[in-house]
């Protein structure tokens, strides 16, 4: 069904401006490279309008093209630390359903202590996004240093 | 078909698509870590549609969730310079009203000469955003190396 | 004034939500610093809705303010390699028509192997965007490491 036809008398919700901005809750147990996120007004400036959290991972509720963005800063880090613990890598991907599993965005820290990037990608209702941080260094939980979000852009 | 023709019963203002992209004007005097921005068609590719500049700082005119983005490149910089002058840090935050003062986004340069990031954040009418660059290195004023902008995303 | 009330008679096309996300096809021949891009559902998660590719370069079809974003990762790269081959620089600009030629966004790799940034910029129908990578290092063609996209934001 074309968006244009359904679009004629539609309120904000139907425009599908789903959006979420999350802050880091915690890292996973040993052998689980995933970062676990949290969001909501009680936590400060994080929020979920449309997408939901499922055990700390972000689940999409509306099909469309999304802008996905992330910043992760390593805690207790200097360029020396970063290069000594290289490679520390951050990957954002669809981790479920398994049939749609794919890496969407990947960066290594090399001699830096922060990575930040963004990209446009099609996502479908039910896609769960996971952010995997591999390496021994811990991410900062400061809300201005580590965050992850999505923004619905168009059908 | 031009957007304007199809647009006749919808003033753009009501869409709330406030947006601004600024270029660096100058750094502050000693003891003032703020960067001072400028924008407008006479200056090239910078612009303000909705938000305003107040003494070089960006003031928001419409409540909503915004995508805030920034890139700052240090002038006369190499990885050696950057690490020797470490820590050089860039922070973007709400600096007024004082009651809403908070750091939204923070990055250190470590051994790099450019930082770039973006995030979604709720902003309210009257919020003024400040960008603080701490350290002794100067930012480049080249318009393709240093810029700061906001984009209204949804109410 | 609520967006929902004003929204009632606007089809998607007239909203002008042109958007594209491209993956790297190849680098240019000797003496051509341009990166050549490709996009489309057959290639995975890249797409063009509005803009077009012209010999691997992105051509804009609708006037407006766009969010331009890019990530480029160097292949076979370590912080040592990156600094040894310095300066490796990535620039995104309007390369045609010649009368509008300008650099929009520029970053150097220094000791890092990935650059990522984004900015808002006015673009006009017919503008062709080129991404120039100067230096001897090759970019990764992995779709989660190197990508380039634009998103129409407002008229």
């Amino acid at each position: 069904q074309r968006f244009a036809q359904a679009q004629q008398q539609l309120p904000l919700e139907s425009l599908g401006w789903d959006v979420a901005e999350l802050q880091l809750n915690h890292t996973g147990p040993q052998q689980d490279p995933r970062l676990y996120w949290q969001g909501g007004p009680a936590l400060g400036r994080s929020f979920l309008h449309g997408p939901e959290l499922d055990k700390g991972q972000l689940r999409i509720h509306r099909d469309g093209i999304y802008m996905v963005h992330i910043q992760v800063t390593l805690a207790i880090c200097s360029s020396t630390t970063a290069s000594r613990h290289h490679p520390t890598t951050l990957a954002v991907g669809i981790c479920s359903p398994a049939s749609r599993s794919i890496s969407l965005l990947r960066l290594s820290f090399h001699q830096g202590c922060t990575i930040a990037s963004q990209r446009l990608t099609p996502l479908a209702r039910g896609d769960t996004l996971c952010t995997n941080l591999t390496g021994t260094l811990l991410p900062s939980r400061n809300t201005d240093e580590t965050f992850f979000g999505v923004q619905w852009v168009r059908p | 078909q031009r957007f304007a023709q199809a647009q006749q019963q919808l003033p753009l203002e009501s869409l709330g698509w406030d947006v601004a992209e600024l270029q660096l004007n100058h750094t502050g005097p000693q003891q003032d870590p703020r960067l001072y921005w400028q924008g407008g068609p006479a200056l090239g590719r910078s612009f303000l549609h909705g938000p305003e500049l107040d003494k070089g700082q960006l003031r928001i005119h419409r409540d909503g969730i915004y995508m805030v983005h920034i890139q700052v490149t240090l002038a006369i910089c190499s990885s050696t310079t950057a690490s020797r002058h470490h820590p050089t840090t860039l922070a973007v935050g709400i600096c007024s009203p004082a009651s809403r003062s908070i750091s939204l986004l923070r990055l250190s340069f470590h051994q790099g000469c450019t930082i770039a990031s973006q995030r979604l954040t709720p902003l309210a009418r009257g919020d003024t955003l400040c960008t603080n660059l701490t350290g002794t290195l100067l930012p480049s004023r080249n318009t393709d190396e240093t810029f700061f902008g906001v984009q209204w995303v949804r109410p | 004034q609520r967006f929902a009330q004003a929204q009632q008679q606007l089809p998607l096309e007239s909203l002008g939500w042109d958007v594209a996300e491209l993956q790297l096809n190849h680098t240019g021949p000797q003496q051509d610093p341009r990166l050549y891009w490709q996009g489309g559902p057959a290639l995975g998660r890249s797409f063009l809705h509005g803009p077009e590719l012209d010999k691997g370069q992105l051509r804009i079809h609708r006037d407006g303010i766009y969010m331009v974003h890019i990530q480029v990762t160097l292949a076979i790269c370590s912080s040592t390699t990156a600094s040894r081959h310095h300066p490796t620089t990535l620039a995104v600009g309007i390369c045609s028509p010649a009368s509008r030629s300008i650099s929009l966004l520029r970053l150097s790799f220094h000791q890092g192997c990935t650059i990522a940034s984004q900015r808002l910029t006015p673009l006009a129908r017919g503008d062709t965007l080129c991404t120039n990578l100067t230096g001897t290092l090759l970019p990764s063609r992995n779709t989660d490491e190197t990508f380039f996209g634009v998103q129409w934001v407002r008229p």
Epitope: P33, H86, P87, T88, T89, A91, G93, S101, I102, S103, S108, N132, T134, G135 | - | H26, T27, G28, T73, L74, A75, I76, C77, S78, C113, T136, L137, L138, S140, R141, N142, E145
Partner: antibody, heavy 118, light 107 residues
């Protein structure tokens, strides 16, 4: 210094399954592509496939669906299984690390000669 | 798949000679080409990546050139330790493919 050490059965009968394991020492497992490459006696090199540390694998279509590459990140090991082998699969099998973005095989195992004979 | 054609398949040369090996690909691959050296009973070793970048620790008598579909490996002054087999390999796409090899023998 990164070292790759590989092991597995060297003599197989047709229709059996080839099974090799490669252990990575002295370096990180994450951030790299881990590959298998083979070389029939007196011939050139053939890429079998690779697996990224996240578990995503890509195989050479010429080997159809006979190939399975898996990894065990807890042991810093990755493995190759090639089923329904024939004499044409007789070769020296190498494990190798695909550096950074998988664009260069910068570290190799010592190689294992696998002979398929009835 | 990208087909790789290496020539010659073998050559005889003397110490001090200049040796050139060529590699042609069936489609455009930019500069996504590596060169490896392999000695009998040993694993291959990278010499050149990205068509022309010398791998750290490799002597400067080795050089690579070309882009697109035609590539060359040159050894300016052949040394005794250079007698070996040489392979080109494309990393433009999967499956990664190798040339059939060039064996450099002592004349």
């Amino acid at each position: 210094q990164v070292q790759l050490q590989q092991w597995g059965a060297g003599l197989l009968k047709p229709s059996e399954t080839l099974s090799l394991t490669c252990a990575v020492y002295g370096g990180s497992f994450s951030g790299f592509y881990w590959s298998w490459i083979r070389q029939p006696p007196g011939k050139g090199l053939e890429w079998i496939g690779e697996i990224y540390h996240s578990g995503h694998a890509t195989n050479n279509p010429s080997l159809k669906s006979r190939v399975t590459i898996s990894l065990d990140t807890s042991k810093n090991q990755f493995s190759l299984k090639l089923n329904s082998v024939t004499a044409a699969d007789t070769a020296v099998y190498y494990c190798a690390r695909g550096g950074n973005s998988g664009y260069i095989f910068d570290y190799w195992g010592q190689g294992t000669l696998v002979t398929v004979s009835s | 798949d990208v087909q790789m054609t290496q020539s010659p398949s073998s050559l005889s040369a003397s110490v001090g000679d200049r040796v050139t090996i060529t590699c042609r690909t069936s489609q455009y691959i930019g500069r996504y080409l590596n060169w490896y050296q392999q000695k009998p009973g040993k694993a291959p070793k990278v010499l050149i990546y990205g068509a022309s970048t010398l791998q750290q620790g490799v002597p400067s008598r080795f050089s690579g050139s070309g882009s697109g579909t035609d590539f060359t490996l040159t050894i300016t002054s052949l040394q005794p330790e250079d007698f070996a087999s040489y392979y080109c390999q494309q990393t433009y796409s999967t499956p990664r493919t190798f040339g059939q090899g060039t064996k450099v023998e002592i004349k």
